[in-house]
């Protein structure tokens, strides 16, 4: 008799999940000399241990502590780029501006980027059929808790001037319910962080509005101010030109506003 399996609303674990995590770990540690000491098998075991045999709606940050410990990494605290709803451009930027880092440029972020995973209570099986959806099922699922944990730690580590890239094409440029809005903003430490600088990325070619005056940006400014941190905001009117100028700062067209 086939065992009854819980049906969740979200997609199941990414196929070949264990192999993908292990392969990514090996690749990352080869490319980043400061992480060469990391034992990728131990990393996988700790990752697996966080969710295997556990109810996928009862995951806690503590479950991920062994993985966090193994993935401890020092990034320059004044070179952190946060992002919200504009991951691709943020990653394109740090690929060019190599001294800046998004969460996905760290080992733990790199391992989990774009992946889904969950297990089942009391079995050692990975659930490839379905996993809990944050809204429809539960918020304390393996993926959400992982990102909440690593995002909190990443924000807590930041110092000096922290940058955040925001999507100016969305109805809520700053969204309190995003990981940035619900976790990272509230874990920036004012004893270390002097300023949060928002880069609002424009979508339309002819969009010359000052999106820094958007009500949701004012909301972000308010939260940051309440945390005793300065806030500044810049419009990036031409993201294509912005990237081009990061690549070639000497270009004569790069002195004008982007």
């Amino acid at each position: 008799v086939p065992r009854w399996r819980q049906q969740w609303s979200g997609p199941g674990t990414t196929k070949r999940f264990p192999e993908t995590v292990l392969a990514r770990c090996v690749k990352y540690t080869e490319i980043h000399p400061e992480m060469r000491h990391v034992d990728c098998q131990s990393v996988w075991d700790a990752f697996k241990g966080a969710f295997i045999s556990k109810h996928p709606c009862n995951i806690t940050e503590e479950d991920y502590q062994p993985l966090m410990k193994l993935g401890t990494q020092t990034v320059p605290c004044n070179k952190i780029l946060l992002w919200s709803r504009i991951k691709d451009l943020a990653h394109q930027f740090t690929q060019v501006q190599r001294d800046m880092f998004t969460l996905e440029d760290t080992l733990l972020g790199y391992l989990a980027d774009d992946l889904t995973w969950c297990g089942e209570f009391n079995t050692s099986k990975i659930n490839y059929q379905s996993c809990p959806d944050w809204r429809k099922d539960c918020s304390n699922n393996p993926v959400s808790v992982f990102w909440k944990t690593v995002s909190r730690r990443f924000a807590e580590a930041a110092c000096d001037v922290v940058h955040v890239m925001l999507n100016g094409s969305r109805s809520k440029i700053f969204d309190k319910n995003s990981t940035f809005g619900s976790v990272e903003v509230h874990n920036l430490q004012p004893e270390k962080v002097q300023t949060l600088e928002a880069w609002v990325i424009h979508g339309g070619r002819e969009d010359s509005r000052d999106l820094c005056q958007d009500p949701t940006i004012k909301e972000l400014e308010s939260i940051i101010s309440k945390r005793n941190i300065q806030f500044s905001c810049k419009n990036i009117y031409r993201p294509d030109k912005f990237l081009q100028c990061v690549k070639n700062p000497e270009d004569s067209s790069c002195t004008s506003e982007i």
Epitope: R152, H186, E191, K218, E219, N228
Partner: antibody
Framework: QIQLVQSGPELKKPGETVKISCKAS????????MNWVKQAPGKGLKWMGW????????TYAEEFKGRFAFSLETSASTAYLQINNLKNEDTATYFC????????????????WGQGTSVTVSS | ETTVTQSPASLSVATGEKVTIRCITS??????MNWYQQKPGEPPKVLIS???TLRPGVPSRFSSSGYGTDFVFTIENTLSEDVADYYC?????????FGGGTKLEIK
């Protein structure tokens, strides 16, 4: 325990300057921003602005730009409000208040207030 | 600037009765509303912070609800010690703005 202690009452003439102090104790001064709130006699509360206790950068509500200045003496855990060229309508009680925050939005609020400093402007 | 309209300006109730104060904001402020109590000659005291959160040490007879533009503050079983002015404060965007206040008296 946490306390914000403000300087005593002031009686001033129009055109003069007043400087009110707000001394914090019982917590790390540089950790929390300091707000200033005005209350005219028999009237409600008005947020004047805040000062970043790390950087010393002030932010003023539109109505309080110009004659009003927030400053700090960090070594003494003290915030100051200075009002220049005093006018009769500046007669009020002025409060300092710390903006508290935690790692969740529900913790954010002006939690500790000074006892208030009464400023009377009269010729 | 977000304006905050508070009502009523004053009210008088018997002890044990329920008190309801309302604040309406001119813009959507999510649940970034705070409620303060001010007794004569004293500074305001926070009762409820953002997210309709009762502050530590504040009696549970005080509560609030609301989201967006419409907010309600309630005192169940009012006591004589609740005589005070009550203010709402929106902290969603600067400049932060207070409601005009409500003077609570006991009959």
């Amino acid at each position: 325990q946490i306390q914000l202690v403000q300087s005593g009452p002031e009686l001033k003439k129009p055109g003069e300057t007043v400087k009110i102090s707000c001394k914090a104790s019982g917590y790390t001064f540089k950790k929390y921003g300091m707000n200033w709130v005005k209350q005219a006699p028999g009237k409600g509360l008005k947020w004047m602005g805040w000062i970043n206790t790390n950087t010393g950068e002030p932010t003023y509500a539109e109505e309080f730009k110009g004659r009003f200045a927030f400053s700090l003496e960090t070594s003494a855990s003290t915030a100051y409000l200075q009002i220049n060229n005093l006018k009769n309508e500046d007669t009020a009680t002025y409060f300092c208040a710390r903006w508290y925050y935690g790692s969740t939005p529900s913790s954010y609020t002006m939690d500790y207030w000074g006892q208030g400093t009464s400023v009377t402007v009269s010729s | 600037e977000t304006t905050v309209t508070q009502s009523p300006a004053s009210l008088s109730v018997a002890t044990g009765e329920k008190v309801t104060i309302r604040c309406i904001t001119s813009t959507d402020i999510d649940d970034d509303m705070n409620w303060y109590q001010q007794k004569p000659g004293e500074p305001p005291k926070v009762l409820i912070s953002e997210g309709n959160t009762l502050r530590p040490g504040v009696p549970s007879r005080f509560s609030s609800s609301g989201y967006g533009t419409d907010f309600v503050f309630t005192i169940e079983n009012t006591l004589s010690e609740d005589v005070a002015d009550y203010y709402c404060l929106q902290s969603n965007n600067m400049p932060y703005t207070f409601g005009g206040g409500t003077k609570l008296e006991i009959k």
